[in-house]
């Protein structure tokens, strides 16, 4: 109720002689701060004096002074909430009741705490899970109702007296709720741990033994078995007898059933610890074991491999791979059931023994067409020789052999002819299904392996064919050797390298790209007139009159071809310059007079300069010089100069006469 002081602390604390006790404690006074605190041992209330009697272990006064003999007992609390105590060392006669007498300004309270001090260190307590099964991880717990800051301890785990190598986790609690030290060990027990003793040992800080607790492990496990066989090597021949015995070395709980298994399958009506096999056959070869069950589950023995030996059975041949491609590798495998395994093999190709081949596998690194046929084998072991089986067929496939392209036409072939070619071959596996031709063209194939080229081109130099099954084999190209008239005839200027100027030495070449046959004749022509019959046309000193359109022709036995017309352009400086006057060379003053500089030039005149009779240049640069209105003073001789990229030319003087008008004459 509200008239009580509120305390929190463990109800009872445990310790042993010479150890210490640490008492975690909290409180809340009814009013104000704590003014006086007395720790009694086994306090008794005296009704006469209305006070408590008993041994005073600790006393604090208002002035805060503590008697020097109270060093063993320490009040670690404060004036309003902490009442923690420490007794170090603690003695056997400290057992009993501790009384905490608390006084504030107006209120008093006695709080009781039980202290249990034993003569010797008390043992910890081991806690185990209700059931332990083999290989299932469990947690072992060792608990000691003791912990004190002034007295360090440790808990160690032992198995059959030997420290356990698994890491334990130790935890301590010193709280108002509980005081303990705990060690937890995670452990995966095996069936062999069944019945073994586990110890939790309490030690002081130096590892000195203080006390311990022990438990015996009860590890549930499936039966553990051993199998024995006669004969011990488990190798027999057909008709022999075999005995197998099953022994249980451990089972927890006790076993309930027994059975035998061959190759993982249970043998019917075999439920005893002995298995007797009489007059064994090869089919009884296999892996045997016994199985014994208990409530945990079935346990199995190790397997015994029983081998029943017999002579090889009729063999079969496996080919990797058929059909085989010529040049590839092939492996033959002789398959025959036998025990022991065959030690010798005899191989046959098309019924004939293959010399030097005695292994299970025959490897041919590079297959050739003649390797095709039937392969069979015979296997042999210590018990006898097997029969030869039916064998396997090897099919060797290869591209068509000895492919040739044949021209069916009479030679020579001329441009424009129709040419027929055929594609021949010697042998093929599988059969030829199609043909290819190089180069590709819009040609017809009237029948398989025949090519017809209509209007053969001059540049159809070579043709090759391929006969194809799964692969194509190409024949060597065959030359058509097509004859044709000269091609790409053109006129080429050899010299000069730059433009042609009047007076230059000029050479023109008649070029053509090809001709078959090679023997040719040349013809040069200008404006329909024959000029020469050489490959070159030469001019020692070209003149403007040589300019014009030139063509050359090239002939062979097939035909003749003309070049495109080629224009010969001769560049020359302005020539034949003259000044013409309009309307004439006599003009009345005030009218208009136009002087024109006429010339012959290639390229045309680009710049004109006009001069008077004094050779004074006039600031006019056009072909025409217009004088308007013309003055009498303009009478005189004029000349012009024309310039192009080749050079200059000048005209002779031309005289302009400007006469007075009737008006001027009348004024005079």
């Amino acid at each position: 109720d509200s008239s009580k002081w509120v305390f929190e602390h463990p109800e009872t604390l445990y310790a042993w002689e010479g150890a210490c006790v640490w008492i975690p404690c909290t409180y809340r006074a009814l009013d104000g701060d704590l003014e006086s605190f007395i720790l009694f041992h086994n306090p008794e209330y005296n009704k006469n004096t209305s006070k408590f009697d008993g041994t005073r272990l600790y006393e604090s006064t208002k002035d805060g002074k503590v008697p020097s003999e109270q060093k063993r007992v320490q009040f670690l609390g404060d004036k309003n909430k902490n009442c923690t105590l420490s007794i170090h060392p603690v003695h056997l006669n400290d057992s009993g009741q501790l009384g905490l007498r608390m006084e504030s300004k107006t209120e008093k309270w006695m709080e009781r705490i039980h202290l249990n001090v034993s003569e010797r260190p008390f043992p910890p307590h081991i806690q185990l899970p209700p059931e332990i099964q083999e290989s299932q991880e469990v947690t072992l717990t060792c608990l000691l109702n003791f912990s004190c800051y002034g007295y360090p301890i440790q808990l160690q785990w032992l198995l059959e007296g030997v420290p356990m190598r698994q890491a334990a986790v130790t935890s301590t609690s010193l709280t108002i709720k509980s005081v303990f030290t705990r060690s937890e060990l995670k452990f995966s027990p095996q069936w062999s741990h069944h019945g073994k003793i586990v110890t939790c040992q309490l030690q002081d800080a130096d590892g000195k033994f203080l006390s311990n607790d022990t438990v015996q492990l009860n590890v549930k496990h499936t039966p553990k078995l051993e199998i024995k066989v006669t004969p011990s090597d488990a190798i027999v021949r057909e008709g022999d007898s075999v005995t197998m015995t099953c022994e249980v070395s451990s089972s927890n709980p006790e076993y309930t059933t027994v059975s035998w298994l061959k190759d993982g399958t249970s043998l019917k009506k075999q439920n005893t610890f002995t298995l007797n096999l009489r007059e064994v056959t090869k089919d009884q070869s296999g892996k045997y074991c016994c199985q014994v069950s208990n409530d945990v589950g079935p346990g199995r023995s190790e397997e015994v491999f029983l081998q029943v030996q017999y002579a090889p059975e009729p063999s079969t041949v496996q080919i990797l791979h058929s059909p085989a491609v010529e040049g590839s590798q092939v492996e033959f495998l002789c398959m025959s059931l036998a025990n022991p395994l065959p030690t010798n093999y005899t191989w046959y190709h098309n019924g004939k023994e293959m010399q030097g081949r005695t292994e299970e596998k025959v490897h041919i690194p590079k297959i050739l067409p003649w390797h095709a046929g039937t392969y069979s084998c015979v296997a042999e072991n210590i018990l006898g020789t097997g029969q030869r089986g039916p064998g396997a067929e090897l099919d060797v496939q290869y591209p068509p052999k000895k492919v040739t392209t044949v021209i069916q036409n009479p030679m020579p072939i001329r441009e424009g002819d129709t040419v027929t070619l055929s594609c021949n071959y010697n042998s093929s596996n599988p059969s030829v299904t199609r043909y290819e031709w190089k180069p590709h063209g819009a040609w017809e194939e009237p029948s398989l392996g025949v090519l017809k080229i209509q209007n053969v081109g001059w540049d159809n130099t070579t043709i090759a064919c391929a006969a194809c099954n799964s692969w194509c084999s190409w024949a060597s190209p065959v030359a058509l050797n097509v004859q044709y008239a000269p091609r790409d005839v053109r006129v080429r200027k050899i010299k000069p390298l730059s433009e042609i100027h009047s007076g230059n030495s000029v050479s023109l070449q008649c070029d053509f790209s090809s001709s078959h046959p090679k023997e040719v004749q040349f013809f040069w022509e200008k404006n329909g007139r024959l000029l020469g019959k050489e490959s070159q046309l030469n001019f020692d000193s070209i003149s403007p009159e040589d300019a014009g359109s030139y063509s050359c022709w090239v002939n062979n036995s097939i035909g003749q071809t003309a070049s495109k017309a080629w224009t010969l352009e001769v560049l020359y400086a302005p020539r034949r310059l003259r000044v013409s006057m309009s309307p004439g060379d006599q003009v009345m003053e005030g009218k208009s007079a136009t002087l024109t500089c006429e010339s012959d030039a290639n390229p045309p005149v680009s710049h004109y300069t006009w001069f008077d009779w004094n050779n004074q240049s006039l600031p006019y640069h056009s072909q025409k010089l217009r004088l308007e209105p013309v003055k009498v003073q303009h009478s005189g001789a004029y000349w012009c100069q024309g310039t192009n990229s080749v050079g200059k030319g000048r005209s002779p003087l031309s005289t302009l006469t400007v006469y007075y008008s009737p008006e001027t004459i009348g004024r005079r």
């Epitope: 300069t609 004074q616 006039l618 056009s622 009498v632 003073q633 303009h634």
Partner: antibody, heavy 118, light 116 residues
Framework: EVKLVESGGGLVLPGGSLKISCAAS????????MYWIRQTPDKRLEWVAY????????FYPDSVKGRFTVSRDNAKNTLYLQMSRLQSEDTAMYYC???????????WGQGTSVTVSS | QPVLTQSSSASFSLGASAKLTCTLS???????IGWYQQQPLKPPKYVME???????HTGDGIPDRFSGSSSGADRYLSISNIQPEDEATYIC?????????????FGGGTKVTVLG
């Protein structure tokens, strides 16, 4: 009456550019060759550009070649002088003039002043 | 290129006759020149075109007092009965084409002062 009127002059920084114009009237502009002539502060006359009636031929003295460009628009009866990379020595009064029939300039404009200074 | 030489100034009494000279460099002695008049604060004005034989073409609005003549490389501009409005600078000029490049050169000008 033949009339030539220049415009576009002004103050320009060294290295700068300026385009001046000359509007012609009173004659058939497309028949005549035209000049630009400048008069320096010391009153000397210097020919700076010459263009044919069609605009096909142009001539310049070495002092302005590559910096000045003369052009004409016969449809607008206008003569132009584009001046670039101007120098202080280009400071002058710029006149346009018509070339007479043979040897001389028979009509001159009033001029436009160009000052090149920083 | 041709070079034109003129005396820098000349003074004449009102009503007197004046004769100004423009000399061409010797190899250009037959060349025709142009005479121009520039009154103060005005543009140059065409006076006449003068040939080496003395024949000339005179500009519009030029009074009959102005005439021209030639002697060798010298070209003369004559003014009879000189008037105050004739006070001006008189400049000669000549054009030429060298290596297909046209050029035009001016003389330094003669400054004419009319006294009285």
């Amino acid at each position: 009456e033949v009339k030539l009127v220049e415009s576009g002059g002004g103050l320009v920084l060294p290295g700068g550019s300026l385009k001046i114009s000359c509007a012609a009237s009173g004659f058939t502009f497309s028949d005549y060759y035209m000049y630009w002539i400048r008069q320096t502060p010391d009153k000397r006359l210097e020919w700076v550009a010459y263009i044919s009636n069609t605009g096909y031929s142009t001539f310049y003295p070495d002092s302005v070649k590559g910096r000045f460009t003369v052009s004409r628009d016969n449809a607008k009866n206008t003569l132009y002088l584009q001046m670039s990379r101007l120098q202080s020595e280009d400071t002058a009064m710029y006149y346009c003039a018509r070339h007479g029939i043979l040897y001389a300039m028979d009509y001159w404009g009033q001029g436009t002043s160009v000052t090149v200074s920083s | 290129q041709p070079v034109l030489t003129q005396s820098s100034s000349a003074s004449f009494s009102l009503g007197a006759s004046a004769k100004l000279t423009c000399t061409l460099s010797s190899q250009y002695s037959t060349y025709t020149i142009g005479w121009y008049q520039q009154q103060p604060l005005k543009p140059p004005k065409y006076v006449m075109e003068l040939k080496h034989d003395g024949s000339r073409h005179t500009g519009d609005g030029i009074p009959d007092r102005f005439s021209g003549s030639s002697s060798g490389a010298d070209r003369y501009l004559s003014i009879s009965n000189i008037q105050p409005e004739d006070e001006a600078t008189y400049i000669c000029g000549v054009g030429d084409t060298i290596k297909e490049q046209f050029m035009y050169v001016f003389g330094g000008g003669t400054k004419v002062t009319v006294l009285g």
